[in-house]
């Protein structure tokens, strides 16, 4: 390896191809799948990451598609359409012309329809509840230590502004992390809570998206915090529109 190649990598996204051919020899990285340029000083959008993931060889995928009736998105894998900024397009369709509307984190928020389905706007997910169950430990974690460690993690690893971590709840063995971010609160350059939650989810599953960094080693006062189950709930600024059939299923 040479200095140029060694230094031309994307620390925040390993699903990229980088080369030092930008203006003035700047290292430029493009997301796999979409070929879109990414800003490696911050998190890559979930849409581009999903697209990159779907472009990877099929045997690289280890997770199965969640149940049709799941109320949470357990890494619901599909090849999304992203806009020029890397956000999810409000309407997503598959190869068989089945379409549905998604929220800003790419989770379906309507029944599936055909190509005539209209999704007028991308509805923002403003509240994310990350529900974790940790493996048994000798005793419960100290709540304030746990709170501090998780807030530090979101601030330092995911670069999420502390004001967007609304609360950390703990009732052994369940930990809940609440992320809140209204459209009006999100300033230019702020990491999106949806992107931070996705990076965290992949970290917890041992599938870190960061380049060359070790996996996530969560410790509370030196005690390893090992997660055995993760559920993520998404709340949108406008409630989803599912038919009664879906709601009673």
């Amino acid at each position: 390896h040479t200095a140029a190649q060694d230094n031309c990598t994307c620390p925040t996204n390993k699903m990229t191809v980088c080369s030092p051919d930008g203006p003035g020899g700047r290292c430029q990285c493009r997301a796999l799948g979409s070929g879109m340029a990414v800003d490696c000083s911050t998190l890559t959008s979930k849409c581009l990451l999903l697209k990159a993931r779907m472009s990877a060889p099929k045997n690289a995928r280890t997770l199965v598609r969640p149940s049709e009736h799941a109320l949470v998105d357990n890494d619901g894998l599909y090849d999304p359409d992203c806009d020029p900024e890397g956000r999810f397009k409000a309407r997503q369709c598959n190869q068989t012309s089945v379409c549905w509307c998604v929220n800003s984190v790419g989770v379906r928020r309507t029944d599936k329809g055909d190509l005539s389905l209209r999704c007028d706007e991308l509805v923002r997910t403003h509240h994310i509840l990350i529900d974790l169950r940790h493996r048994p430990t000798a005793g419960a974690f100290n709540h304030s230590d746990l709170d501090a460690e998780l807030r530090r993690l979101f601030r330092e690893r995911y670069r999420l502004h502390p004001k967007f971590v609304a609360a950390v709840h703990y009732e052994q063995p369940t930990i809940q992390i609440e992320l809140r971010q209204n459209t009006s609160q999100k300033a230019a350059g702020d990491v999106d809570i949806g992107d931070a939650a996705y990076y965290f989810e992949r970290d917890i599953k041992g599938e870190s998206l960061f380049q060359g960094r070790g996996g996530l080693d969560l410790r509370v006062r030196g005690e390893p915090l090992q997660v055995e189950r993760t559920l993520i709930y998404y709340l949108d600024e406008i409630p989803p529109k599912f038919s009664m059939k879906r709601l009673t299923a």
Epitope: T2, A3, A4, Q5, N7, S19, P20, D21, G22, P23, G24, G25, R26, C27
Partner: antibody, heavy 116, light 107 residues
Framework: QVQLVQSGAEVKKPGSSVKVSCKAS????????INWVRQAPGQGLEWMGQ????????HYNQKFQGRATLTADKSTNTAYMELSSLRSEDTAVYYC?????????WGQGTLVTVSS | DIQMTQSPSSLSASVGDRVTITCKAS??????LSWYQQKPGKAPKSLIY???RLVDGVPSRFSGSGSGTDFTLTISSLQPEDFATYYC?????????FGGGTKVEIK
């Protein structure tokens, strides 16, 4: 150490073409971009274009689009800049420079004089 | 194209003086700015890249600062070998553009 050695001075007639070479050594040629910059007598620096030998991608200053051609010969680690339809205002010192993240190593320069 | 306005175009200073040269971009350039020194009849030499990173081997009296659109090259204590012309370059986007240059002369 990184070295860029350019071809010698040229005197050209208006309307003709000139091809300046830039031989690189001391690093892997395909790993860095080469930029071309010119400087008219007593004037400032003017960017002409950039080539990345690793993938033969290039970018040109619109001002030189169609007149300048950048190429790279990976077998000899040499970059070339050809400028056609020369006019008197093209009289300048032409520099090649290896760039990485804005940090540049420069060739010694090639004086091209266009005169009838 | 991004315009780079360098000032002053020339200045006279004495050995030991603190010298400041500024470069203003017509739009934000994300700190993708370099500074070069050029002496008569010679090729330019890199001093600073990424707005504030000193090139290996360049004396620590040279420093770069600024962000957004306004950038500064400072020579903390001018030495005899520093009399030259200085250029800034933006490499945020194509085409790359240089400032007009600042000639530092002996007072």
């Amino acid at each position: 150490q990184v070295q860029l050695v350019q071809s010698g001075a040229e005197v050209k007639k208006p309307g003709s073409s000139v091809k300046v070479s830039c031989k690189a050594s001391g690093y892997r040629f395909t790993d860095y971009v080469i930029n071309w910059v010119r400087q008219a007598p007593g004037q400032g620096l003017e960017w002409m274009g950039q080539i990345y030998p690793g993938s033969d991608t290039f970018h040109y200053n619109q001002k030189f689009q169609g007149r300048a051609t950048l190429t790279a010969d990976k077998s000899t680690n040499t970059a070339y800049m050809e400028l056609s339809s020369l006019r008197s205002e093209d009289t300048a010192v032409y520099y090649c420079a290896r760039f990485f993240e804005g940090l540049a190593y420069w060739g010694q320069g090639t004086l091209v004089t266009v005169s009838s | 194209d991004i315009q780079m306005t360098q000032s002053p175009s020339s200045l006279s200073a004495s050995v030991g003086d603190r010298v400041t040269i500024t470069c203003k971009a017509s739009q934000g350039i994300n700190n993708y700015l370099s500074w070069y020194q050029q002496k008569p009849g010679k090729a330019p030499k890199s001093l600073i890249y990424r707005a504030n990173r000193l090139v290996d081997g360049v004396p620590s009296r040279f420093s770069g600062s600024g962000s957004g659109t306004d950038f500064t090259l400072t020579i903390s204590s001018l030495q005899p070998e520093d009399f030259a012309t200085y250029y800034c370059l933006q490499y945020d986007e194509f085409p790359l553009t240089f400032g007009g240059g600042t000639k530092v002369e002996i007072k």
